[in-house]
Amino acid sequence: PRSIDVKYIGVKSAYVSYDVQKRTIYLNITNTLNITNNNYYSVEVENITAQVQFAKTVIGKARLNNITHIGPLDMKQIDYTVPTVIAEEMSYMYDFCTLISIKVHNIVLMMQVTVTTTYFGHSEQISQERYQYVDCGRNTTYQLGQSEYLNVLQPQQ
């Protein structure tokens, strides 16, 4: 069998909401993956599991099942959304993310994704992880790959 290539493209969009009383930030982060099947037979994308970390703490997880199949020598682009919550011991971030005087409230998140594919009863897992900048202060739609190398304005400690 030839390889199945998984390429994490980046953040597609991030939608923000807040709970004022709980000083909590809710970020719905949609990511884009390219999965390429280099084989001469179809493969099934059985599931995608993803998690997002902020400051070494897992702030969101998602799992998609029975996603799609990819034909021979074909590629599919898949979007998946991870709902994340920045709260509790990280509630200090609420102050930073809600500063109306700052235009871009970039925070660094680590995106981890594992894709499980199957073909002829054989299962294969491919994992990727990438640091991305996400604006926690407003709803943002990114050009693909745009969120990777932005300058990040760090909150005061």
Epitope: Y18, V20, T98, L99, I100, S101, I102, K103, L153
Partner: antibody, heavy 119, light 112 residues
Framework: QVQLQQSGAELVKPGASVKISCKGS????????MNWVKQRPGKGLEWIGQ????????NYNGKFKGKATLTADKSSTTAYIHLSSLTSEDSAVYFC????????????WGQGTSVTVSS | DVVMTQTPLSLPVSLGDQASISCRSS???????????LHWYVQKPGQSPKLLIY???NRFSGVPDRFSGSGSGTDFTLKISRVEAEDLGVYFC?????????FGGGTKLESK
């Protein structure tokens, strides 16, 4: 330390226009909104609008749309206000003021530029 | 536009006295993020305004602790516990919760 240095006083004729400058130093000029505030003699303060030098984004007080145009030059770290079709009502002191990130208030002000409109 | 009403217009005080300035807004100044953007500035003759108190009650750096701010919603107060000569000037409240940003008409703190 943060400094905002404004250009000198102006005496202009009615119907003319004027451009006032505000040079910022001692901070990351491109990353802070710059505001402009009008104060007529013996009167209160009026917010004209603001500009984000990083990308030129602006927000105006509707009252000053068409009267004031805000611009900024990142390379010289200078913000400008252009006032057009001047009348006696535009005679005032104009202040630039930086919008601070963490206090979320106008925490540093220029010394003010006096504009007198007279024939 | 949000109207900011300051009282009194003029406040004659003796040095060492307490001074209290009121500021009332025509609508709530609580932002959707839960913060209240009500600031106080002081302006001395021939000078630019200076930030005194931000977000209702936070003293700006270098501001003496005889200055305090309080209030919520639409009603706010600036207090000076013991007025000193250097405190004399015009005090303005300001809101930036709503665009356009607006200022109170000012209160002149003067010596009796």
């Amino acid at each position: 330390q943060v400094q905002l240095q404004q250009s000198g006083a102006e005496l202009v004729k009615p119907g003319a226009s004027v451009k006032i400058s505000c040079k910022g130093s001692g901070y990351a000029f491109s990353s802070y909104w710059m505001n402009w505030v009008k104060q007529r003699p013996g009167k209160g303060l009026e917010w004209i609008g603001q500009i984000y030098p990083g990308d030129g984004d602006t927000n105006y007080n509707g009252k000053f749309k068409g009267k004031a145009t805000l611009t900024a030059d990142k390379s010289s770290t200078t913000a400008y206000i252009h006032l057009s079709s001047l009348t006696s009502e535009d005679s005032a002191v104009y202040f630039c003021a930086r919008w601070g990130h963490y206090d979320e208030a106008m925490d540093d002000w220029g010394q003010g530029t006096s504009v007198t409109v007279s024939s | 536009d949000v109207v900011m009403t300051q009282t009194p217009l003029s406040l004659p005080v003796s040095l060492g006295d307490q001074a209290s300035i009121s500021c009332r807004s025509s609508q709530s100044l609580v932002h959707s993020n839960g913060k209240t953007y009500l600031h106080w500035y002081v302006q001395k003759p021939g000078q630019s305004p200076k930030l005194l108190i931000y977000k209702i009650s936070n003293r700006f750096s270098g501001v003496p602790d005889r200055f305090s701010g309080s209030g919520s919603g639409t009603d706010f107060t600036l207090k000076i516990s013991r007025v000193e000569a250097e405190d004399l000037g015009v005090y303005f409240c300001s809101q930036i919760t709503h665009v356009p940003w607006t200022f109170g008409g000012g209160t002149k703190l003067e010596s009796k």
